[in-house]
């Protein structure tokens, strides 16, 4: 997803952020999940994307670009509403579904010009096109009923590029799916830590071979596994130390001793 300057941002007056945490630097935290998030960049005065590790970090972190702008850019909602009210349906509403090249499997919505409705589709996590909305409501406001809904213009933030589907109609496909061997997972009541520490090691969907560590809640130890570069789950750490730091604190050894530190 691109971080292009938004036309409306340049119109915003005061450069002082609305909240002190908006001035904090992006902090991905010590964990190694890969969660697309947004932060307010004090230097560019824009909300920008970063990859959050899944734990710790700071308050300058938002799930959506829209949420970031509403929270940290003074006067953003007012300006965005003014820009969108009475607008015609944007051209990108007519673009065909494009899942993009990545393998992230995200639930998204697009406007289907055949059915004249917003529909769910699976987005891979990068590239694709701007007919791509995080919520059904957002899609409807912008593409189904653009005139009657004076709401902020979609900020899925794709670069200006050329993309179109259906170059040929060939349907053959190959699935490169690695089915991981699931280690023994203890009963949930034995573990009080982060939920993903209970997940089995998952090699993911791709073809790389990266050394990673996962927390085995049955043994209370972090073990090495090969990660293929995409997919998988959040029980995935680049070092044994990070793995232990994130997951070991939640293991209940027995009733008298409590949590292992």
């Amino acid at each position: 997803l691109s971080e292009e300057a938004d036309d409306t941002d340049s119109e915003l007056g005061s450069m002082k952020p609305l909240h002190t945490f908006c001035a904090m630097k992006a902090d991905d935290g010590p964990c190694k999940a890969m969660i697309r998030s947004y932060f307010f960049n004090m230097y560019t005065h824009q909300c920008e994307e970063f990859i959050y590790g899944g734990c710790e970090g700071n308050e300058n972190r938002f799930d959506t670009l829209e949420e970031c702008k509403k929270t940290c850019i003074p006067g953003y909602e007012k300006t965005a509403v003014k820009a969108a009210s009475g607008a015609e349906r944007p051209d990108f509403c007519f673009l065909e579904e494009d899942p993009g090249l990545c393998r992230g499997y995200m639930k998204r919505y697009l406007y289907n010009n055949q059915t004249k409705q917003c529909e769910r589709f699976v987005y891979g996590g990068c590239l694709g096109n701007r007919n791509n909305f995080e919520t059904l409501d957002e899609c409807k406001k912008i593409c189904e009923n653009p005139v009657h809904s004076p709401s902020p213009v979609n900020e899925v933030q794709m670069s200006d590029y050329v993309t179109d589907g259906n170059t040929v109609t060939d349907r053959s496909t190959v699935n490169n799916i690695v089915v991981p061997q699931s280690p023994k997972v203890p009963r949930r009541r034995d573990y009080r830590g982060r939920p993903w520490c209970l997940q089995p090691a998952d090699s993911g969907l791709c073809k790389a071979s990266e050394r990673r560590f996962y927390y085995n809640s049955a043994t209370g130890k972090c073990h090495r596994f090969n990660y293929t570069g995409c997919g998988g789950n959040n029980n995935n750490f680049t070092t044994r130390r990070r793995c232990l730091r994130s997951c070991k604190t939640g293991l209940i050894k027995n009733k008298s001793k409590g949590v292992v530190k």
Partner: antibody
């Protein structure tokens, strides 16, 4: 081990069509874990991305705006290869052309395997 | 298009030196930045993807860092086989664009 083998003429006349083929071994052109593309390199312009194709239950493509009106990248599933066609070439299109595999991860797309390169000269 | 600017354009170094190459994007690109190495007459070779993840089989003396607009490729101890040209490339949006390259030469 994935390998890409390029083939095609090294000399093309101005206004004609440049055609190159990239044969894939060790992977499938219709694999759903990435895509296939073309990049060229010339002393004047450096490395220039031209476009790519990928398969996700149907075929998709993306082309650089600079060549959009002249370029076609097509898969050939029967031969497990893909091709580049660049129409109406001029001497400006003289470059070393590379095919590449684009591997898609959760958030990243990168060229992890490249063809050997083909020097294409456009001259009468 | 997103412009990628590398510095320096070339540098001279000795075996064992620590070498740092920087790449700046004309706009924020999160961590969608990859590094390639190219030797004369050869195709580029992927070193690092996602700004900091080492590609399988690449020696650990190579490392990458940065996010947003400023990125760095570091070779901790230069080896004879590392004399080459290095390119950064953004994948934030189409068209993918490359830096102009940094040539690492023997001092």
């Amino acid at each position: 081990q994935v390998q890409l083998q390029q083939s095609g003429p090294g000399l093309v006349k101005p206004s004609q069509t440049l055609s190159l083929t990239c044969a894939i071994s060790g992977d499938s052109v219709s694999s759903n874990s990435g895509g296939w593309g073309w990049i060229r390199q010339s002393p004047g312009r450096g490395l220039e991305w031209l476009g790519l194709i990928y398969y996700r239950s149907k075929w998709y493509n993306a082309y650089a705006v600079s060549v959009k009106s002249r370029i076609t990248i097509n898969p050939d599933t029967s031969k497990n290869q893909f091709s580049l066609q660049l129409n109406s070439v001029t001497p400006e299109d003289t470059a070393v052309y590379y095919c590449a595999r684009y591997l898609g991860s959760n958030f990243y797309v990168y060229s992890d395997v490249w063809g050997q390169g083909t020097l294409v000269t456009v001259s009468s | 298009d997103i412009q990628m600017t590398q510095s320096p354009s070339s540098l001279s170094a000795s075996v064992g030196d620590r070498v740092t190459i920087t790449c700046r994007a004309s706009q924020g690109i999160s961590s969608y930045l990859h590094w390639y190495q190219q030797k004369p007459g050869k195709a580029p070779k992927l070193l690092i993807y996602g700004a900091s993840t080492l590609q399988s089989g690449v020696p650990s003396r190579f490392s990458g860092s940065g996010s947003g607009t400023d990125f760095t490729l570091t070779i901790s101890s230069l080896q004879p086989e590392d004399f080459a040209t290095y390119y950064c490339q953004q994948q934030n949006g189409y068209p993918f664009t490359f830096g102009q390259g940094t040539k690492v030469e023997i001092k």
